[in-house]
Interface confidence: low
């Protein structure tokens, strides 16, 4: 058993049929010595008396809020949550496996630049009685500070018969050094509580590996005289790290016909313009990637050829 | 020559070669998400790798103030990785083809380090860790880890030289 926060405790249980469970001793936080009784949740049934209560925690029916009273007055509470371990593996019932970039990916994180700011998100089908708490640090053995906000519900989607809820959190490294070569990964830890079930999820990454620039901005076409060619120009996204002479991007320019089956013409360039042939009913798209480190491409910015 | 301690680095040459290094480092080990190398216990390789740290003056402000602090660290790293790529980790089984990206990477690391090295002057560089994996699979894993680390190192070096070429060239 360990304390998650004040008056909230997590009991770690090996979860299998007829498991012996865990013996837990609760102590009433009071100077009083006698006349103390214990109850669980809303029930008025007295579970025991005395300053301590010893219980055997085996299942969710044994978890909940234990309260000690004296003469009708509440003295203190202890909320017990369960953390299940099945076949040596901690349960992951609350969050959905996103399976990208690999199986057992519950948390996904992205950064728009090297400022030390990043966003993580996760998915669940649970709609109520759900709380999340997020902590993060640079490195684990000698952690350096990363400050995370509160996790918020950021999207709701219908997937078949199910509703899916996306939660996200923004974090900022306290002393970020955008130009340095990271040697210690960022660690993100999410505590998830659904009713009386506790689970924790972790992710470890370098900012450089989760970089995904915003799409290029101000995408414009300029027809070239007496030619089917156009000059496409664009700018670095506002959110990208500066100066651009240091934090450089590379770009992919694509000409795509109306039909997905039509051949795509692609040009790669480090410049912020390119000359391409504009076909009727086609569209021109541009996306960006860090020039020197192959992290994710941005989403496409597009304009029609007409 | 882009000389640590010298006053006029050959920024454009260094930029071109460092960008080539980035391309080679990724073609030598393109896998990004398929193998989480950090899970394999990195201690023996990464502890001694000369990372480009916050205090090395490789940020735009530090380069403007004076690029020599940064050039030293880059030079030190290039020599370090050049030695690693020439070691038993890469020359042992499973053997690499003579024209593999790793061979080109090794040659380019040497080329850039020589651009940064004043003739007849040999800077002290830290020793490479004594790593001699006994099994081919261990060697393979170590190669991946070293190449992943090198990708990060050369990315910073390439940014430095690109910025230098754009803003610090005479």
């Amino acid at each position: 058993i360990w304390e998650l926060k004040k008056d909230v405790y997590v009991v770690e249980l090996d979860w299998y049929p007829d498991a012996p469970g865990e013996m837990v001793v609760l102590t009433c936080d009071t100077p009083e010595e006698d006349g103390i009784t214990w109850t669980l949740d809303q029930s008025s049934e007295v579970l025991g008396s005395g300053k301590t209560l010893t219980i055997q925690v085996k299942e969710f029916g044994d978890a909940g809020q234990y309260t000690c009273h004296k003469g009708g007055e509440v003295l203190s509470h202890s909320l017990l949550l369960l953390h299940k371990k099945e076949d040596g593996i901690w349960s992951t019932d609350i969050l959905k496996d996103q399976k990208e970039p690999k199986n057992k990916t519950f948390l996904r994180c992205e950064a728009k630049n090297y400022s030390g700011r990043f966003t993580c998100w996760w998915l669940t089908t649970i709609s109520t009685d759900l709380t999340f708490s997020v902590k993060s640090s640079r490195g684990s053995s000698d952690p350096q500070g990363v400050t995370c906000g509160a996790a918020t519900l950021s999207a709701e989607r219908v997937r078949g018969d199910n509703k899916e809820y996306e939660y996200s959190v923004e974090c900022q490294e306290d002393s970020a050094c955008p130009a340095a070569e990271e040697s210690l990964p960022i660690e993100v830890m999410v505590d998830a509580v659904h009713k009386l079930k506790y689970e924790n999820y972790t992710s470890s990454f370098f900012i450089r590996d989760i970089i995904k620039p915003d799409p290029p901005k101000n995408l414009q076409l300029k027809p070239l005289k007496n030619s089917r060619q156009v000059e496409v120009s664009w700018e670095y996204p506002d959110t990208w790290s500066t100066p651009h002479s240091y934090f450089s991007l590379t770009f992919c320019v694509q000409v795509q016909g109306k039909s997905k089956r039509e051949k795509k013409d692609r040009v790669f360039t480090d410049k912020t313009s390119a000359t391409v042939i504009c076909r009727k009913n086609a569209s021109i798209s541009v996306r960006a990637q860090d020039r020197y480190y192959s992290s994710s491409w941005s989403e496409w910015a597009s304009v029609p050829c007409s | 020559r882009a000389v640590p301690g010298g006053s006029s680095p050959a920024w454009t040459q260094c930029q071109q070669l460092s960008q080539k290094l980035c391309t080679l480092a990724w073609s030598a080990h393109p896998l990004v998400g398929h193998m989480d190398l950090r899970e394999e216990g990195d201690e023996e390789t990464t502890n001694d790798v000369p990372h480009i740290q916050c205090g090395d003056g490789c940020d735009p402000q530090g380069l403007r103030d004076n690029s020599q602090f940064c050039l030293q660290r880059i030079h030190q790293g290039l020599i370090f990785y050049e030695k690693l790529l020439g070691s038993d980790i890469f020359t042992g089984e499973p053997s690499l083809l003579p024209d593999s990206p790793v061979a080109q990477l090794h040659a380019s690391l040497l080329g850039l380090s020589q651009l940064l090295q004043p003739e007849g002057h040999h800077w002290e560089t830290q020793q490479i860790p004594s790593l001699s994996p006994s099994q081919p699979w261990q060697r393979l894993l170590l190669r991946f880890k070293i190449l992943r680390s090198l990708q990060a190192f050369v990315a910073v070096a390439a940014r430095v030289f690109a910025h230098g070429a754009a803003t610090l060239s005479p």
Epitope: A180 | S7, Q53, G55, N66, H121, W123
Partner: antibody, heavy 117, light 111 residues
């Protein structure tokens, strides 16, 4: 043998000027930075500033900016620390030291500057 | 007032082990900057003892070792000898204009 040899002890009056030197030998002087460090009687080390002899680029600690001038002449492998108007509080031992991969790996023997009326 | 804080003095008997701490902040040691240690024997110039947190220049006995954790660093001396009696200073880079900062120094007495 790599060494830095500093000029001899100086006794000066307040308001006088002074230039002390630090000559490097046994290595390529231009390829290493030279830093200056002050140690007041019975006190600790204080970093004053640093110079790259190859291009005479200097950087000063804010505490010493405007109080001293650091210069170098790479043709004679010598760095200098100078005051235009000494104060009694400038009484101290002044060390020059070489910087490269290893910070301040070689030190001069020190120059004792005494300022007294 | 030094930017890096060291204990003014430490002492130990011959053969013993002593450690000297050096505490900085998020703008110097905590920013990932290396820590270096210098030894100053009485009446002599300082000498580089440890650089880059834990590396020893050639000629420095392996009785001297350095480590760094978070915003602080420490120097350990094992098998204390009478000739180790000296002042010891830590130094680091720092954010802002100062560039180099020293600790206030620690006087080591061998009893």
């Amino acid at each position: 043998e790599v060494q830095l040899v500093q000029s001899g002890a100086e006794v000066k009056k307040p308001g006088e000027s002074l230039k002390i030197s630090c000559k490097g030998s046994g290595y390529s002087f231009s390829n290493y930075w030279i830093g200056w460090v002050r140690q007041m009687p019975g006190k600790g080390l204080e970093w004053m500033g640093i110079i790259d002899p190859s291009n005479s680029y200097t950087r000063y600690s804010p505490s010493f900016q405007g109080q001293v001038t650091i210069s170098a002449d790479k043709s004679i492998s010598t760095a200098y620390l100078q005051w235009s108007s000494l104060k009694a509080s400038d009484t101290a031992m002044y060390y020059c030291a070489r910087w490269y991969y290893k910070p301040f790996d070689v030190w001069g023997q020190g120059t004792l500057v005494t300022v007294s009326s | 007032q030094s930017v890096l804080t060291q204990p003014p003095s430490v002492s130990g008997a011959p053969g013993q082990r002593v450690t000297i701490s050096c505490t900085g902040s998020s703008s110097n040691i905590g920013s990932g900057y290396d820590v270096h240690w210098y030894q100053q024997l009485p009446g002599t110039a300082p000498k580089l003892l440890i650089y880059g947190n834990s590396k020893r220049p050639s000629g420095v006995p392996d009785r001297f070792s350095g480590s760094k954790s978070g915003t602080s660093a420490s120097l350990a001396i094992t098998g204390l000898q009478s000739e180790d009696e000296a002042d010891y200073y830590c130094a680091s880079w720092t954010d802002g204009l100062s560039l180099v900062v020293f600790g206030g120094g620690t006087k080591l007495t061998v009893l």
